[in-house]
């Protein structure tokens, strides 16, 4: 009878094992062991009895003890199991943003492992078992559907793989995938929402604003605003859910025309586009040409209004005759057109939206000098040593100068305050003086004496 | 003991289409993946693709996708390599080979080769 | 892809002598797992490739202890203790951590 020991062993994959082959008889013909494994056979007293050292034992292999003993031959075989842990465990690549509501499937693929049968895949979120199944087939594949979560954001997912040999008195092997860390996110159907000037002048400035509710994570959102080719810094303020950019932007004469303004909000792998139209325009105020901003009275000049070809104008408020972007008006010079002012007033339609612009002029009408009764009256009559102010005032542009005198050197003073006196009485001569000549006027003041009362 | 055991050698035409064999036997066949290699002469030894022989899921090198064609039939014990299009470079010694699907602890038995000629 | 220069291109060794073979590699092959998966394959005349050393170091079954296998990251050697008439032929080494996989060039092993 051939007996081995152990009849059953369990080894790491490489591992080394001795193996007893003994027989019940005393003195075998033959005894030994067959295997195709590296072995060396250890020196024992006896012949019923062959320790053998099996080395790099790299599958489960059935070593088999023989004799041959006077009663006839017989065998025994030994069970070598060889266990190791498995190569790879890894769950197949994923995108790391997953909108929320959508399925996402979780595929752990688990390469090499024995025993099989020991070996054990589980697919976690955190440390809460999701799916537990042995590993089948090469690789071993298990997977499992989550539906995405708000709260699963940030979650980590894995896979662990758990050879399990404490029922042969040694211990659970663990191996573990990296993490897959999930970022959920929602992104709603609705586009972000664009508010800017329909119109935009060359040469000035406008603000855009993009918003947007309901976003989450709203801090991981991306606004990109652009108008045409030129991308806009905005300044990008969030809420709970929700983001409003704002920005400045700025347009030269070379982005006249149509332009295309658009604010693109991205979130994971998902964006929400809004488009929106801005015309660029040149407008410039509408000219108003005097033929001489400055004119004598009596003088015929000429009023033009002129503005951007595609304007309306009007002069004064009479529109142009037909109506178009020139505008005129003829008129002889007066005193009393003096600071009048010609406002030209030019109307263009952009996009459908009406632009206003005005420009006005002053006129300057030089006249005078001027002396006449109700300004300078030619007669007074004051009581003696009463109070009184004389009053003489010149007209003309520009201003002439005055000066009132008795005998060609006593000065009335004008517009001061005076006690009336003997010496005031007289005649006196008032001559205004200007650029534009003199003028006198006669002034007589007679003092009346208290003893005439 | 472990055996993989190949169709025989093939001459083709240019343009054709060539479809090899490989039979395991001595292990469990679906315990493994197998692995097809090819040898041109004076080249390198150059990986072609693997197919899971339990799921039949298949990887390919990014040169032979769309050429080459790896399938399995578990019943038989048997995975097969068509190659198509195929032109006088695809001359070579194809070998199937056991391993784990990611080849990790190496190719550990192999086919005896199929010489496969291409020539008009 | 990842390439693999094997050094010498021929290697002619007396009988019982040592022998090794250099392998490097363009690109790291650890593993994210930590693991190296650079393994070593013999080809004798006539044969199909067969494997000698997985994972760096770690002997198949059947191969005899004279062969051993070393080397981390890009440099990786192959040693024969003592050459034996048996041993002829060529040695490639051959790697598994980036896809696709690729072998080296090939070593040619004789006896002087």
């Known amino acids: 009878q051939t007996s081995v020991s152990p009849s059953k062993v369990i080894l790491p994959r490489g591992g080394s094992v001795l193996v007893t082959c003994s027989t019940s008889c005393d003195q075998p013909k033959l005894l030994g062991i067959e295997t195709p494994l590296p072995k060396k056979e250890l020196l024992l007293p006896g012949n019923n009895r062959k320790v053998y050292e099996l080395s790099n034992v790299q599958e489960d292999s059935q070593p088999m003890c023989y004799s041959n003993c006077p009663d006839g031959q017989s065998t025994a075989k030994t069970f070598l199991t060889v266990y190791w842990t498995p190569e790879r465990v890894e769950l197949a690549p994923l995108p790391s943003w997953q909108p929320v509501g959508k399925n996402l499937t979780l595929r752990c693929q688990v390469e090499g492992g024995a025993p099989r049968a020991n070996l054990t895949v589980v697919l976690l979120r955190g440390e809460k078992e999701l799916k537990r199944e042995p590993a089948v087939g090469e690789p071993a594949e298990v997977t499992t559907t989550v539906l995405v979560r708000r709260d699963h954001h940030g979650a980590n997912f894995s896979c662990r793989t758990e050879l399990d040999l404490r029922p042969q008195g040694l211990e659970l092997f663990e191996n573990t995938s990296a993490p897959y860390q999930l970022q959920t996110f929602v992104l709603p159907a609705t586009p972000p929402q664009l508010v800017s000037p329909r119109v935009l002048e060359v040469d000035t400035q406008g603000t855009v604003v993009c918003s947007l509710d309901g976003l989450f994570p709203v801090s991981e959102a991306q606004v990109h605003l652009a108008l045409g080719d030129q991308r806009l810094n905005p300044t990008v303020t969030y809420g709970n859910d929700s983001f409003s950019a704002k920005a400045s932007v700025s347009v030269t004469a070379e982005d006249e025309g149509t332009q295309r303004l658009t604010c693109a909000v991205i979130l994971g792998n998902q964006s929400q586009e809004t488009l929106q139209t801005v015309t660029i325009y040149s407008f410039p105020a509408p000219n108003v040409i005097l033929t001489k901003p400055e004119v004598s009275e009596g003088t015929e000049v000429t009023v033009k209004c002129e503005a951007h070809p595609r304007a309306k104008v009007t002069l004064n408020g009479v529109p142009a005759q037909p109506l178009g972007p020139r505008a005129q008006l003829l008129l002889k010079a007066t005193p009393e057109d003096n600071g009048r002012s010609f406002s030209c007033s030019a109307t263009l339609e952009v996009a459908g939206q009406l632009i206003h612009k005005n420009q006005t002029r002053e006129l300057r009408v030089l006249y005078g000098p001027r002396l006449d009764e109700r300004d300078c009256p030619g007669n007074w009559t004051w009581p003696e040593n009463s109070q009184q102010t004389p009053m003489c005032q010149a007209w003309g542009n520009p201003l002439p100068e005055l000066k009132c005198l008795k005998d060609g050197t006593f000065p009335l003073p004008i517009g001061e305050s005076v006690t009336v006196t003997r010496d005031l009485e007289g005649t006196y001569l008032c001559r205004a003086r200007s650029t534009q000549g003199e003028v006198t006027r006669k002034v007589t003041v007679n003092v009346l004496s208290p003893r005439y009362e | 003991q472990v055996q993989l055991v190949q169709s025989g050698a093939e001459v083709k035409k240019p343009g054709a289409s060539v479809k090899i064999s490989c039979k395991g036997s001595g292990y469990t066949f679906t315990d493994y993946a197998l692995h097809w290699v090819r040898q041109a002469p004076g080249q390198r030894l150059e990986w072609m693709g693997v197919i899971s022989t339990y799921s039949g899921n298949t990887d390919y090198n990014q040169k032979f996708r769309g050429r080459a064609t790896i399938t399995v039939d578990t019943s038989a014990s048997t995975a097969y390599m068509e190659l198509s299009s195929l032109r006088s470079e695809d001359t070579a010694v194809y070998y199937c080979a056991r391993s784990l699907y990611f080849g990790s602890s190496g190719f550990d038995y192999w086919g005896q080769g199929t010489a496969l000629t291409v020539s008009s | 892809d990842v390439v693999l220069t094997q050094s010498p291109l021929s290697l002619p060794v007396t009988l019982g002598q040592p022998a090794s073979i250099s392998c490097r590699s363009s690109q790291t092959l650890v593993y994210r797992n930590g693991n190296t998966y650079l393994h070593w394959y013999q080809q004798r005349p006539g044969q199909s490739p067969r494997l000698l050393i997985y994972k760096v170091s770690n002997r198949f079954s059947g191969v005899p202890d004279r062969f051993s296998g070393s080397g981390s990251g890009t440099d990786f050697t192959l040693k024969i203790s003592r050459v034996e008439a048996e041993d002829v032929g060529v040695y490639f080494c051959?790697?598994?951590?980036?896809?696709?996989?690729?072998f080296g060039g090939g070593t040619k092993l004789e006896i002087k």
């Open positions: 051959s790697q598994n951590t980036h896809f696709p996989y690729t």
